[in-house]
Interface confidence: low
């Protein structure tokens, strides 16, 4: 570590003194302080000397020697006073330019260290400090204000007490700079905007930054627009504020509107679009398709997506039949806003019974008129079979009765013994009926099918299935000839619980 | 179709304010930005300053000082005021309803208004 | 002396084209558009052309606008004696926040 001579950390002369500094380290030293008049710098060998053969309150400073080469950076310091009881203060800048948050340091440096307990930081003009400030006094540094916010932006004198009187620095202005965290915010109200010709419209593009220091403006089409800038400042910010009015708006008007802001750190901007209407709209439509089939028990949601202008006078979901007159519970019925004009209505039908199926009509009503986009529900059932003996034009005939949604398939199965249910070892024979005989097959009901099978003579230790199946499932009947007569068997009660 | 109309005095001693008012029918006043403007021999055509019917103003930097521009929304009315008035000043001035563009697409027939003792 | 540039006169016969030009800078003309403006002695100015080339509705098309960088022109063609009026341009100033004229041109029908 370099060493100064005199050994002292404080010297104190007069005016008009010799001053000599000498500064010995192992290798080249340096001084280092503030710049001012008189000092003469020279080297001898290992040590530098730093001389005045005049020194003024301009020399007061803190004078530091460094070793350049040392790693360690080692250095040694000693504050010089020139007291000059006409210049209790040194002030080494007249500006001093921090960012929000840092700590100033405004450099009134004390020219007698006996004035330390007199000293305090004034506003020019004698104004005190605002509300809040935080400061310190160092005699050497001079004055800090920790913290600094941009309110703080002044210009500042420092005040010593000798004999009596108060003597102030010249003043130092502060500039506190915001930290700009980047472009500007900006705001474009609306984001999307449509009017019939003749009425009238608003858009307002607004910007706002911790710094005054940006620029804002709104384009159309990429023409700028010449709007005149209402300025305002809360919440800590800036603001810029364009708002274009438009009484009557006419097809022109439409198209593309941005609001571009930009400051130092670059360039935000936001668009939405504008429509002109000759006359209200109001479309319906849905991803889904109109016809929907679903099994029996399970739930479907029914979405109807609506474009409006202007907005719904009205809506409902409404029930058509055929089956029941009831009406959708309000409660199920869901709608959501995706943005000013573009709504999205959700009919919730959860675990459906037979007697929902039918018509679902979702109505909606604005000044252009009535609308409406209608559902049409269809139920998937398994099939349910059932199998007679009978007689036709004299023939015994199996006549076996298939009722499901989509229409069942059937088909016979001929197996050896007695059984519920053929199984692929006991099958003798068997028949796919391609053509069942469609007895019923209105909208949103079951389609019932009849298939018959023409048995000259009923083999008594055999059994015969009829079997159907659809997209759903499938079902069957065993018949079971015996002695006494025809004895029929369903594999399982059928059970219905939707 | 919108007018304007302006009034006040026609000659104002110089050092004292000129007032006038700008009366807007065929519309409201409650939308758009409103102006004056004055043509003088001397400067041409000048933009004073625009208002809007919340009380927002822009001052052309040369008069900023000296200009005060209000609006009455109740009487459909904006006005100018201009203070510290010098033989400078005198010219024709015109109220107008502010273009979108910067433009003026209506005006008035205009005042002229003399400074002169 | 005013922001934008005109020539005060302009001349011509009628049936003729006769173009008047504008100059001005990049804070008005360079990044804003140019409005015209037709004035007769004794009455309001009245809007000729906005946003560089759009007519209002009644003006004849026979008035037409143009920009280039920092200077716009009105072209007037077949030229009628009730053209003759004084000729504004005028812009926004990004410096001034605020529109800026030009000193007029007088067109006179011979």
């Known amino acids: 570590i370099p060493v100064i001579e005199p050994s002292v950390p404080e010297l104190v002369v007069k005016p008009g003194a010799t001053v000599t500094l000498r500064c010995v380290g192992n290798g080249s030293v340096e001084w280092d302080g503030p710049p001012s008049p008189h000092w003469t710098l020279y080297s001898d060998g290992s040590s530098s000397i730093l001389s005045t053969n005049n020194a003024t309150f301009q020399n007061t400073g803190t004078y530091r020697c460094t070793e350049p080469g040392d790693p360690l950076g080692g250095s040694a310091a000693i504050h010089l006073y020139v007291k000059d009881p006409a210049r209790p203060w040194n002030v080494l800048a007249q500006e001093v330019v921090v960012f929000e948050d840092q700590d100033a340091l405004l450099p009134c440096l004390l020219t007698d260290p006996v004035l330390e307990a007199g000293v305090s930081l004034v506003r020019v003009r004698g104004r005190p400090l605002m509300r809040h400030t935080n400061y310190s006094f160092s005699p050497w540094h001079g004055f800090t204000i920790h913290r600094a916010k941009f309110i703080q932006s002044q210009d500042y004198q420092c005040s010593a007490l000798m004999g009596g009187r108060k003597v102030m620095s010249i003043s130092i202005r502060l500039k506190v700079q915001k930290v700009i965290p980047g472009p500007p915010a900006l705001t474009l109200v609306p984001a999307e905007l449509v009017r019939i010709r003749g009425e009238a419209a608003q858009i307002v593009c607004s910007a706002s930054s911790v710094d005054v220091n940006f620029d804002v403006f709104l384009q159309h089409n990429n023409t700028k627009l010449a709007i005149p800038q209402q300025s305002d400042f809360h919440n800590n910010r800036y603001q810029k504020v364009l708002t274009l009015n438009l009484d009557q708006v006419d097809f022109q008007h439409a198209g593309n509107y941005s609001c571009v802001a930009s400051n130092v750190q670059g360039k935000h901007s936001t668009s939405m679009f504008f429509r002109v209407v000759e006359s209200a709209y109001l479309n319906l439509s849905s991803e889904q398709n109109l016809i929907q089939e679903v099994t029996v028990g399970e739930g479907l949601n029914l979405k109807v997506m609506v474009e409006a202008y202007p907005g719904l006078q009205g809506f409902n979901w409404t029930y058509l039949g055929p089956f029941s007159d009831h009406q959708p519970e309000p409660k199920l019925a869901n709608a959501t806003t995706k943005d000013t004009y573009r709504h999205t209505f959700t009919l919730s039908l959860p675990r459906l019974k037979p007697s929902e199926a039918g018509r679902y009509s979702f109505l909606a009503r604005n000044p252009g008129g009535w609308r409406a986009l209608t559902f049409e529900l269809t139920l998937r059932y398994p099939p349910e079979v059932s199998v007679i003996w009978t007689f036709i034009n004299g023939s015994g005939t199996l006549l076996c009765a298939a009722s499901g949604y989509p229409q069942p398939n059937v088909t016979w199965l001929q197996c050896s013994g007695h059984t519920d249910r053929c199984d692929e070892a006991q099958v003798l024979q068997v028949w796919d009926d391609p053509y069942p005989e469609v007895l019923s097959q209105e909208p949103f009901h079951k389609v019932t099918v009849q298939s018959l099978l023409t048995v000259e003579t009923l083999e008594h230790n055999q059994t015969y299935e009829c079997r159907a199946h659809n997209s759903v499932g499938s079902g069957s009947w065993a018949f079971i000839p015996i002695s006494a007569g025809a004895h029929t068997h369903p594999p399982d009660e059928f059970l219905f619980t939707p | 179709q919108v007018q304007l109309q302006e009034s006040g005095p026609g000659l104002v001693k110089p050092s004292e304010t000129l007032s006038l008012t700008c009366t807007v029918s065929?519309?409201?006043?409650?939308?758009?930005?409103w102006s004056w403007i004055r043509q003088s021999p001397g400067k041409g055509l000048e933009w004073i300053g625009y208002i809007y019917y919340s009380g927002s103003t822009n001052y052309n930097p040369s008069l900023k000082s000296r200009v005060t521009i209000s609006v009455d929304t109740s009487k459909n009315q904006f006005s100018l005021k201009l203070s510290s008035v010098t033989a400078a000043d005198t010219a024709v001035y015109f109220c107008a309803r502010a273009l979108l563009t910067g433009g003026f697409a209506y005006w008035g027939q205009g005042t002229l208004v003399t400074v002169s003792s | 002396q005013s922001v934008l540039t005109q020539p005060p006169s302009a001349s011509g016969t009628p049936g003729q084209r006769v173009t008047i030009s504008c100059s001005g800078s990049s804070s008005n003309i360079g990044s804003n558009t140019v409005n015209w403006y037709q004035q007769f002695p004794g009455t309001a100015p009245k809007l000729l052309i906005y946003s560089n080339n759009q007519r209002p509705s009644g003006v004849p098309d026979r008035f037409s606008g143009s920009k280039s960088g920092t200077s716009a022109s009105l072209a007037i063609s077949g030229l009628q004696s009730e053209d003759e009026a004084d000729y504004y341009c005028?812009?926004?100033?990004?410096?001034?926040?605020?529109?800026?004229f030009g000193g007029g041109t007088k067109l006179t029908v011979l």
């Open positions: 065929g519309g409201s006043i409650s939308s758009y930005y």
């Open positions: 005028a812009a926004w100033d990004d410096s001034l926040n605020g529109p800026v």
